[in-house]
Interface confidence: medium
């Protein structure tokens, strides 16, 4: 079951999954000036069995020189909030990630991929939060959120994290304190949440509707 919402937003914090549950999908998005190859995969899918999980499908981008590159994001009917984009955080691979049964590692980058990775999480997925550079974490509890199913609807638990404006960075579990970026980035780019706004993902499986697909009942 896919989570029907994004993980909660925490001011001045970003979230990241340590590993991705089977069923998770990642959009094959390309950077400006590029697009998916013709009839190429729209997504990568974390699949596997109890002993091994991996990403199915490969994302491929090609130049879209002949295509209007100013095309806007076209929301599908559930769009309600503005898509936020920011520079993608470098993929993180904790040592214990591979040992998690039923989970996939962060997929390696593909050529000309977009600057933001768009994941579709499934129920049971956990994401961890950290304060962005220049903010310090005040923990009231776990700095994590889990997608749960309640009364037939999905919801994310609320992470217990507050980020205050002090020059110290809270880390993801098991992550080394990062070195300052040589280029440096303005605070306006780092003090907003890196959202993983989700997009619809194509399924390659054959899909059919039952022949007796409709019934009508007068009331």
């Amino acid at each position: 079951e896919l989570c029907d919402d994004d993980p909660p937003e925490i001011p001045h914090a970003t979230f990241k999954a340590m590993a991705y549950k089977e069923g998770t999908m990642l959009n094959c998005e390309c950077k400006r000036g590029f697009r998916r190859i013709k009839s190429g995969s729209l997504y990568m899918l974390c699949t596997g069995n109890s002993s091994h999980s991996s990403w199915d499908n490969q994302c491929q981008c090609t130049s879209s020189a002949t295509r209007n590159t100013t095309k806007q994001v076209t929301p599908q009917p559930e769009e309600q909030k503005e898509r936020k984009t920011t520079e993608m955080q470098s993929p993180m691979q904790p040592v214990d990630q591979a040992s998690l049964p039923g989970h996939c590692r962060e997929p390696p980058p593909w050529e000309n991929e977009a600057t933001e990775r768009i994941y579709h999480f499934v129920v049971g997925q956990m994401v961890y939060y950290q304060c962005v550079q220049g903010y310090r974490a005040l923990h009231r509890g776990p700095a994590e959120s889990v997608c749960k199913m309640t009364h037939g609807k999905t919801r994310w638990t609320q992470p217990q994290l507050i980020c205050t404006g002090e020059m110290e960075t809270s880390q993801f579990p098991g992550e080394e304190k990062p070195q300052a970026s040589p280029e440096g980035r303005p605070e306006s780019e780092t003090s907003c949440l890196v959202t993983t706004t989700d997009f619809q993902i194509q399924t390659e499986m054959a899909a059919t509707m039952e022949t007796s697909i409709f019934t009508t009942e007068y009331q």
Epitope: L2, D4, Q200, Q202
Partner: antibody, heavy 111, light 106 residues
Amino acid sequence: PGGSLRLSCAASGFTFSSYSMNWVRQAPGKGLEWVSSISSSSSYIYYADSVKGRFTISRDNAKNSLYLQMNSLRAEDTAVYYCARDQLAARRGYYYGMDVWGQGTTVTVSS
Amino acid sequence: VLTQPPSVSVAPGQTATIACGGNNIGTKSVHWYQQKPGQAPVLVVYDDSDRPSGIPERFSGSNSGNTATLTISRVEAGDEADYYCQVWDSSSDHVVFGGGTKLTVL
């Protein structure tokens, strides 16, 4: 006219709970008209202006079923009603059309 | 509002083009459906120019400016159908269909 009707759509062959679903209708001799959309776990619902306040879309993922409750029916609601699946799983962002359609059911509203 | 010509006629083996007009439609993703009499619609082109699996390469699409176009090359008798363009209108949160074009194979 003024009556109520409930349409049901039973899906199979794909993970129903992972897909947004739609109702689209077609009046006799006319074109396609979108009616309503519902996201995978019902958090996001949209209606065409022509049916807003009268029709209610819902789904039961445990039963792989989509529903359309139609109240205060009018003559202009007479049409073939199709249920259709959004091509891509999940719920927001890029929209890629509807790739699986039911065969349709005819609704006639007359006095 | 998406505007389509009510009808287009073409001889077998020739190329049919069906236009879908809309204000700045080139900034939206356009999808095309084929509907034969008595049948449900079938998605033939999505995201302007991509084809779902099973759709012949003869079907192609383009989108720029105020017009999206569905092109069917080497038209066959079996292509005779109604064709609809469709977009998602983010300003109204609505799915919008064009009025449809009846393709007649002479």
